[in-house]
Amino acid sequence: QDEDFKASDDLTSISPEKRFKVSISGTEVVVTCPDVFGYDNIKWEKNDNLVEGASNRELSQKEFSEVDDSGYYACYADSIKEKSYLYLRARVCANCIEVN
Amino acid sequence: FKVSVEELEDRVFLSCNTSVLRIEGTMGIQLPHSRTLDLGKRILDPRGIYRCNATEEQSDKAPYMQVYYRMCQNCVELNSATLA
């Protein structure tokens, strides 16, 4: 891997609660919103469109499609001004595991 | 002031109307005479957190953009032969 593109070891510059968590298992992708505020109501957007019925910290897609579901995700709370953005592109497969 | 993600051929590029500020993660290469950051090949799963560069007065209008690629280059299919 090209030295210039290495992932930095310094992952302490932004607090963990400000990061999205992405969990992938088989074809299911679960995105967890950063802790925008501890007990506020959450809204999700995908490519700038409101995701209807999504009001939890987790946004789950059971049959994730790389083509249809990759893109910009944002979550925010009613009383939080700054949206958190994620650009996600994921390739999934039903019966596989990722090895290092 | 929002980072945009573009893919050209097999590479991932981040761009802003200013320049891209890396907060953490994949370092990438700043393209010369450009407001674009080259994060490298997408099959290498670039990941990180970025913001558009902004003046102190405008910094509140530059949200964080987390980039997460998972192209499954190291995925192994589990079938009866694999499990045997």
Partner: antibody, heavy 116, light 107 residues
Framework: EVQLVESGGDLVKPAGSLRLSCVAS????????MSWVRQGPEKGLQLVAG????????YYTDAVRGRFTISRDNAKNTMYLQMNSLRDEDTAIYYC?????????WGQGTLVTVSS | SYELTQPPSVNVTLRETAHITCGGD??????VQWIQQIPGQAPVVIIY???NRPTGIPERFSGANSGNTATLTISGALAEDEADYYC?????????FGEGTQLTVLR
């Protein structure tokens, strides 16, 4: 007009219990997160507890976690704060507030005094 | 943890304009509330989400927020505006308050 009316404050001995209520009107209660905040004798304001609109997510400040329980009854437009194992330092005026991070209305408060 | 900085006191002549500031790192990326507390009375939100007034709050109160500073402006201060003013933001899991600014209206 938004109204938040707290009740249940009293003089109580250390280790005692109290239950505060906050009755809301003038807005759709079930759409909003709600909060309890207190102001002690030293004038400082402190968020005590909060709960999202459907009651599925709660927050407690470290000083009260494990002793206080926030709850709500959306059918009755009412929020509660059950306070157990009360301590001297819990003495304060307790206010309920509409909203989570950016509250726009507070009630008039109810006084809780913990003293032997 | 996040900190908000307010001047301890501000003086304004009756019917003149008062500005109370609230400083915080990238505060413009957060919603700011301004809370008025007249001595012996309950706190009242006079501005929420930077520049919105709850019902019943006079138009002379306005708010602005960008960069590292939020400002409460009282245009044509009246004697009844003499009070403590707190700025507040929601940060991570809790509320953060400024130390408060005592506004004195000089007659």
């Amino acid at each position: 007009e938004v109204q938040l009316v707290e009740s249940g404050g009293d003089l109580v001995k250390p280790a005692g219990s109290l239950r505060l209520s906050c009755v809301a009107s003038g807005f759709t209660f079930s759409d909003y997160s709600m909060s309890w905040v207190r102001q002690g004798p030293e004038k400082g304001l402190q968020l005590v507890a909060g709960m999202n609109s459907d009651g599925s997510t709660t927050y407690y400040t470290d000083a009260v976690r494990g002793r206080f329980t926030i709850s709500r009854d959306n059918a009755k437009n009412t929020m509660y704060l059950q306070m157990n194992s009360l301590r001297d330092e819990d003495t304060a005026i307790y206010y309920c507030a509409k909203g989570a991070a950016a509250p726009d209305y507070w009630g008039q408060g109810t006084l809780v005094t913990v003293s032997s | 943890s996040y900190e908000l900085t307010q001047p301890p006191s501000v003086n304004v002549t009756l019917r003149e304009t008062a500005h109370i500031t609230c400083g915080g790192d990238r505060i413009g990326s957060k919603y700011v509330q301004w809370i008025q507390q007249i001595p012996g009375q309950a706190p009242v939100v006079i501005i929420y989400k930077d520049n919105n007034r709850p019902t019943g709050i006079p138009e002379r109160f306005s708010g602005a927020n960008s960069g590292n500073t939020a400002t409460l402006t009282i245009s044509g201060a009246l004697a009844e505006d003499e009070a403590d003013y707190y700025c507040q933001v929601g940060d991570n899991y809790t509320w953060v308050f400024g130390e408060g600014t005592q506004l004195t209206v000089l007659r």
